[in-house]
């Protein structure tokens, strides 16, 4: 069969029709089914939303809806002992507790089960001792502290304001600073917008709202009893002792309100400059310890969470390709929430919910896709991307040999500003074209197209008349089809004005705020912005599933193959004394993207000129695009962290939302001026040069003809 | 409409106990720090304790510390004040008030009800 | 903590009244201002310094800085007498803090 014969409808005709299929008022209606109750990892109720997606998915006529489940390691407050921390006197009495759970929003007060603020993965534990202000835990607000200030959090208990990086890394930093405890919390000058009102007036942080999240360090290894495999009935699970990636000191997050009564009372060392200052009425002091009156008070941790291995269900509905069922194209996003989901992940879970009633309506009228699709409700995403690396662990073998591309779909808004995509280079071309087919929900770019308002709001910083588009970090259920696997992937959202919104995130993120009211009153009343994100997502899955050759074009891969080798050379041109001493060249690095360019102009032109009809040309083909994201995969992963195996990009080791290019060289000249050995740590730097020149080489290899 | 209505307030003798109630509607009373305030006849406002909206935290004047307790029961939207050992300068017209946010410490008191008269004598 | 108001303080209609609150460092803290009229509970007309709740005249406003908060009312009104009270929260006792009312007198 041909590809047409196999969809029954011209290309162009199927796209329009499963856009113009896509409707706002379905995804405002998903959404509020999705947001009345909480969605909890691993609790009844969202095993309950599984089945009745699961339901629904079959009603909307993909070919099969299955339920996938793996029994995790999850994390839970201990309902009749309450976490929360005290400022102690020196007899021991309790004079302050921070709060036991948020004030509940109207209409919201007789919710059951709304898990209180925490920390998640945190051990027990009831650390005492004084307090230090670590700014934003980062790695250079510790460098600062221990090596410019002199201050030793070493048996302290630490406080960090959330944002810029993930928790994690925030835990991770104070661990290795020898602390005994760490406070999170959110300050007005990161999570509330200067002009608009705190929830429920509008969509700025209450000074009682607290932002949840895992404080896990997994690099990529899904359960942690589990790593590398899959969570299943016959699983050999580790003891807790060797889990991987689990804090070793109590955690837990407050709000501003709570922050407030802790950081007043600082004493010790002034911040260093005003980069280490908040928003609210205190001195931002450093300590260690309480101020003149206070100093003989200490902060008292009270920790009682309880890890769980318990039950998550993955939800995944497939749609049979016509012409290559062997080839399989994902749109994934997560279905669990800390609490009620509003933006996270409900608003993603109702796109995507529309995007398959799409699918199934064109489906039912005859038509299929040339490839594969397969669509994923993820569980657990937010106890560490637990769904969707134990099934991708359970299915790596096909995923390897028959994964074309991942979509992810976690949160379709973050803002109502602009676009934001990030993606693999391979897919810079389809989401070029992709918008310029789109309309704008932009007010002012009435008429014109996404990529015209996109463009204008958001500039590439490299090329004029291009958006920005990103690096993939981590953080989301990419992760283990993109850093693992070496499969394309690409996400993309609504996001804010980042000129004027310097805030980390959005305000209410993780917080009970996060409801239906807010998405509907504040940030998409019409859902256009819902609407224009499922028409961005939608239609690169459709293009991927449905065009005759892959809407991949290598030659972008080329491009950032030299900007990152660029960019490389010039850090480790910083230091040109030693580059000389240890001989360090990066000749090799420079070369081998020279070939690449070479060899995927060649390819390009090619692809051009071959004759389509061959079907096993074609396949050919469509095979080299499809395998060249896996050919950046390293089987023996990076330094430390098996589960990342991809050579271009990493999660940043200081903060895995962020991606790293060529993250081996970057992680061996991090702060190599300070390693007590620089022979061996230039050493270091010469094979990871050695091995990113190889793979970029190995993989040029895979775009030469075959014989 | 957000509405305090004290109850409560009587005549007793010294060295006595007196409960007093406060009921509130029109707003999610879980949400907000709930303090209660007196003023003798003929002075100002006296602050007399506070509670936070999930009843972690209580504070005292010095005056009434030891001898007054303040809770809560959010399930009824109802705010308690037991007043023990009461003496004749407890004598006075007693406000619950809310504060405008959740936080019962910095911010203002944005609703009061219109008080509830306890005096003490002999 | 002290904070320390005038007895009282007049003013002619029309013309522009300012109450002061006086307490160490004040400039530091949040200062709440409440107005109660003979036989009422207090109303809350400014909180956080300077802000207004929803249903109080623009007439009514706010400052604070150094050892002196001050609540002005201008084009003051025969319906504006009223004893007027600030009130701090002094994190050093974990107290509220009243001042001790100022009556104003509009002539």
């Known amino acids: 069969k041909s590809s047409n014969e196999a969809t029954n409808i011209t290309p162009k005709h199927n796209m329009k029709a499963f856009l113009d299929e896509l409707k706002a008022e379905n995804i405002k209606k998903f959404l509020y089914n999705f947001t009345q109750i909480p969605h909890l990892a691993g609790t009844e109720q969202n095993f309950q939303l599984a089945k009745q997606i699961q339901s629904q998915w079959k009603e909307f006529g993909l070919d099969s809806v299955e339920l996938a489940h793996y029994d995790v390691l999850l994390s839970y407050p201990n309902k009749t002992h309450p976490n929360y921390i005290s400022i102690i006197n020196e007899d021991g009495n309790e004079i302050f507790n921070t709060s036991l759970f948020e004030p509940p929003p109207p209409g919201y007060e007789n919710v059951s089960d709304i898990v209180p603020p925490f920390s998640a993965f945190s051990p027990q534990g009831m650390p005492e001792g004084d307090l230090v202000y670590v700014n934003y835990a980062r790695t250079e607000d510790f460098f600062k502290l221990e090596r410019d200030m002199k201050i030793n959090c070493s048996g302290k208990i630490v406080i960090a304001r959330y944002g810029k990086v993930f928790r994690g890394n925030k835990v991770k930093n104070a661990q290795l600073a020898g602390a005994k405890g760490v406070i999170l919390y959110s300050d007005p000058a990161d999570y509330f917008a200067p002009g608009v009102k705190s929830y429920p007036d509008g969509w700025n942080l209450p000074g009682g709202g607290v932002q949840r999240g895992n404080i896990l360090n997994l690099n990529g290894a899904g359960d942690p009893l589990t790593p590398g495999y899959p969570a299943n009935e016959y699983a050999y699970r580790r003891g807790i002792a060797e889990a991987v990636g689990l804090p070793s000191i109590p955690v837990h997050p407050i709000g501003y309100y709570d922050a407030q009564k802790l950081l007043e009372k600082m004493g010790g060392s002034a911040p260093p400059d005003s980069s280490w200052r908040g928003s609210l009425k205190v001195p931002y002091n450093v300590g260690p310890g309480f101020t003149g009156n206070f100093s003989t008070q200490k902060v008292k941790m009270h920790i009682h969470s309880t890890n769980e291995v318990t039950r998550i269900y993955n939800v995944i509905g497939t749609l049979r390709g016509a012409v290559e069922p062997d080839r399989y194209v994902i749109l994934g996003g997560h279905r669990d929430s800390w609490v009620f989901g509003g933006i996270d992940p409900q608003s993603g879970a109702a796109v995507v919910h529309e995007i398959v009633r799409s699918f199934g309506t064109l489906k039912k009228e005859g038509w299929r896709p040339r490839r594969t699709i397969l669509f994923a409700s993820w569980d657990a995403e937010e106890f560490g991307l637990l769904g969707s690396t134990e099934w991708a662990e359970e299915n790596s073998r096909l995923l390897q040999e028959r994964g074309v591309a991942y979509i992810n779909a976690d949160s379709s808004i973050e803002g109502n500003y602009t676009l934001r995509v990030d993606c693999t280079p391979l897919m810079y071309s389809l989401v070029h074209n992709l918008t310029k087919e789109l309309k704008s929900p932009d007010e002012g770019f009435e008429g014109k197209s996404l990529y015209e308002s996109w463009t204008k709001k958001s500039p590439s910083p490299e090329f004029s008349g291009m958006p920005r588009i990103s690096k993939l970090g981590s953080g989301n259920d990419f992760e283990v089809f993109f850093q693992r696997l070496g499969i394309a992937s690409g996400r993309a959202r609504y996001t804010k004005n980042w000129e004027t919104n310097k805030f980390s995130g959005y305000p209410l993120y993780h917080s009970v705020y996060e409801t239906y009211e807010l998405v509907e009153k504040f940030y998409d009343p019409m859902f256009k912005y819902h609407l224009t994100v499922a028409q961005v997502r939608g239609g690169m899955v459709f293009e991927l599933a449905n065009s005759i050759v892959l809407p991949f074009d290598c030659r972008d891969y080329a491009v950032v193959l030299r900007k990152y080798a660029d960019k490389i050379y010039s850090i480790s041109m910083k230091h040109p004394q030693e580059m000389k001493t240890y001989s360090v060249s990066f000749d090799s690095l420079f070369s081998a993207v020279k070939n690449f360019t070479e060899i995927a102009s060649k390819f390009s032109e090619r692809l051009q000129d071959f004759d389509k009809s061959n079907p096993i040309v074609l396949r050919m083909m469509n095979d080299q695009l499809m395998f060249l994201e896996r050919a950046f995969i390293d089987p023996l992963g990076l330094p430390d962290r098996p589960f990342y195996r991809h050579v271009i990009y990493a999660p940043s080791s200081h903060n895995k939302y962020a991606g790293e290019s060529f993250p081996g060289i970057y992680d061996a000249l991090f702060d190599i001026e300070s390693k007590v050995d620089p022979s061996k740590a230039w050493g270091e730097v010469k094979r990871q040069i050695y091995v990113a020149a190889f793979t970029v080489q190995a993989a040029a290899e895979t775009l030469s003809e075959v014989a | 409409q957000v509405q305090l209505q004290e109850s409560g307030g009587d005549v007793v003798q010294p060295g006595r106990s007196l409960r007093l109630s406060c009921a509130a509607s029109?707003?999610?009373?879980?949400?907000?720090?709930l303090h209660w305030v007196r003023q003798a006849p003929g002075r100002g406002l006296e602050w007399v304790t506070l509670?936070?909206?999930?009843?972690?935290?209580?504070y005292y004047a010095d005056s009434v510390k030891g001898r007054f307790t303040i809770s809560r029961d959010n399930s009824k939207n109802t705010l308690y004040l037991q007043m023990n050992s009461l003496r004749a300068e407890d004598t006075a017209v007693y406000y619950c008030?809310?504060?405008?946010?959740?936080?019962?410490?910095?911010?203002?008191?944005?609703?009061w009800g219109q008080g509830t008269t306890v005096t003490v004598s002999s | 903590y002290e904070l320390t108001q005038p007895p009282s303080v007049s003013v002619a209609p029309g013309q522009t009244a300012r109450i002061t609150c006086g307490g160490n460092?004040?400039?530091?803290?949040?200062v709440h201002w409440y107005q109660q009229k003979p036989g009422q509970a207090p109303v809350l007309v400014v909180y956080d310094d300077s802000d207004r709740p929803s249903g109080i005249p623009e007439r009514f406003s706010g400052t604070n800085s150094g050892n002196t908060a001050t609540l002005t009312i201008s084009r003051a009104e025969a319906g504006d007498e009223a004893d007027y009270y600030c009130q701090v929260w002094d994190s050093s006792s974990d107290h509220v803090v009243f001042g001790g009312g100022t009556k104003l007198t509009v002539l």
């Open positions: 509670i936070s909206y999930d009843g972690s935290n209580k």
């Open positions: 029109g707003f999610s009373f879980s949400g907000y720090g």
């Open positions: 460092n004040i400039g530091s803290k949040s």
């Open positions: 008030a809310k504060t405008t946010v959740s936080d019962p410490y910095y911010y203002g008191m944005d609703v």
